[in-house]
């Protein structure tokens, strides 16, 4: 069956954890991608802004989880949730705005 | 104030088992990420392991000398670590530390912060 | 398994400049940390990230990376600074720390 969105919620903050401990290194060589409004549609919109990422093994898990809680198909070049693209920040950036907001979301118990 | 205090150290024969415990107080345990090292005598620091924090999936890693003999522990409510150690060994005799773990000091929840206990001291001999 | 390597000891006389390297393959990509620890008593945290420096700790140390080498350079090294220290770092998962084999540094009183 589908799995529930705690369960997904925290592997998805594990997997941003995997990605970022004690790295100094650019991710996925300093790549820069859309910054994105962390409210409603954020699981969308971080898919949408990752995915035109290629080529970067160390992200693919993370997005194959925000696959999983998008609820629509989400392919590269689409932007329908990413409502303002005026800034674009590293991954490594991204991925720790991402988590901060992730954990958040979590000890407020708000799953979805 | 900022403190871990270890205790359940003590002498034991080879093959026995002891169990320590660092108990923490001054920050918010629950975020923070959790690391055993250890010092035999005259010699320098090995780390022995670490736990997450629960929210970041509580992982817990060893090192490959310890690695099916101990196990890391956390109780968040009663802010405690713990170091099972059983199987020992002469070589496991050492001042173990337990520590707030650097690696894991990110995000806003206790970001830079170092804290170490003062250490108790297992023996293992005959 | 993934090793640090530093200079069993360093002397200095008081006032120079003392530099305790640490070297590892992982190093260009995850960060190092330097820990203090005098006779009998805790380590304490000197310098994290390569570079950062905690608070409470003298702005004579410093700390710096390039390629596979981690450096913490004493700038006018003091009697009290006497002590062993070590670096640390992780392997390249992040996930199984390592410290180097310390480095005893002697400051000629």
């Known amino acids: 069956g589908p799995v529930p969105p705690s369960t997904a919620l925290r592997e998805l903050i594990e997997e941003l954890v995997n990605i970022t401990q004690n790295q100094k290194a650019p991710l996925c060589n300093g790549s820069m991608v859309w910054s994105i409004n962390l409210t409603a549609g954020m699981y969308c919109a971080a898919l949408e802004s990752l995915i035109n990422v290629s080529g970067c093994s160390a992200i693919y898990r993370t997005q194959r989880i925000l696959h999983g809680l998008c609820p629509h198909k989400v392919s590269a070049g689409q932007f329908s949730s990413l409502h303002v693209r005026d800034t674009k920040i590293e991954v490594a950036q991204f991925v720790k705005d991402l988590l901060l907001h992730l954990k958040k979301l979590f000890r407020e118990g708000q799953f979805n | 104030e900022v403190q871990l205090v270890e205790s359940g150290g003590g002498l034991v024969k080879p093959g026995g088992s002891l169990r320590l415990s660092c108990a923490a107080s001054?920050?918010?345990?629950?975020?923070?990420?959790m690391s055993w090292v250890r010092q035999a005598p005259g010699k320098g620091l090995e780390w022995v392991g670490r736990i997450r924090s629960k929210i970041d999936g509580g992982t817990i890693n060893y090192a490959a000398p310890v690695k099916g003999r101990f196990t890391i522990s956390r109780d968040d409510s009663k802010n405690t670590l713990y170091l099972q150690m059983n199987s020992l060994k002469t070589e496991d005799t050492a001042v173990y530390y337990c520590?707030?773990?650097?690696?894991?000091?990110?995000?806003?929840?206790?970001?830079?912060?170092?804290?170490w206990g003062q250490g108790t001291t297992v023996t293992v001999s005959s | 398994s993934y090793e640090l390597t530093q200079p069993p000891s360093v002397s200095v006389s008081p006032g120079q400049t003392a530099r305790i390297t640490c070297s590892g393959d992982?190093?260009?990509?995850?960060?190092a940390y330097w820990y203090q620890q005098k006779s009998g008593q805790a380590p304490v945290l000197v310098i994290y990230e390569d570079t950062k420096r905690p608070s409470g700790i003298p702005e004579r140390f410093s700390g710096s990376s390039s390629g596979t080498m981690a450096t913490l350079t004493i700038s006018g090294a003091q009697v009290e600074d006497e002590a062993d220290y070590y670096c640390?770092?992780?392997?390249?998962?992040?996930?199984?720390?390592?410290f180097g084999g310390g480095t005893k540094l002697t400051v000629l009183g």
């Open positions: 992982a190093l260009p990509e995850k960060y």
């Open positions: 001054g920050f918010t345990f629950s975020n923070a990420w």
């Open positions: 520590a707030t773990d650097q690696v894991g000091a990110y995000y806003g929840d206790y970001y830079g912060m170092d804290v």
């Open positions: 640390y770092s992780t392997d390249s998962s992040g996930n199984h720390g390592v």
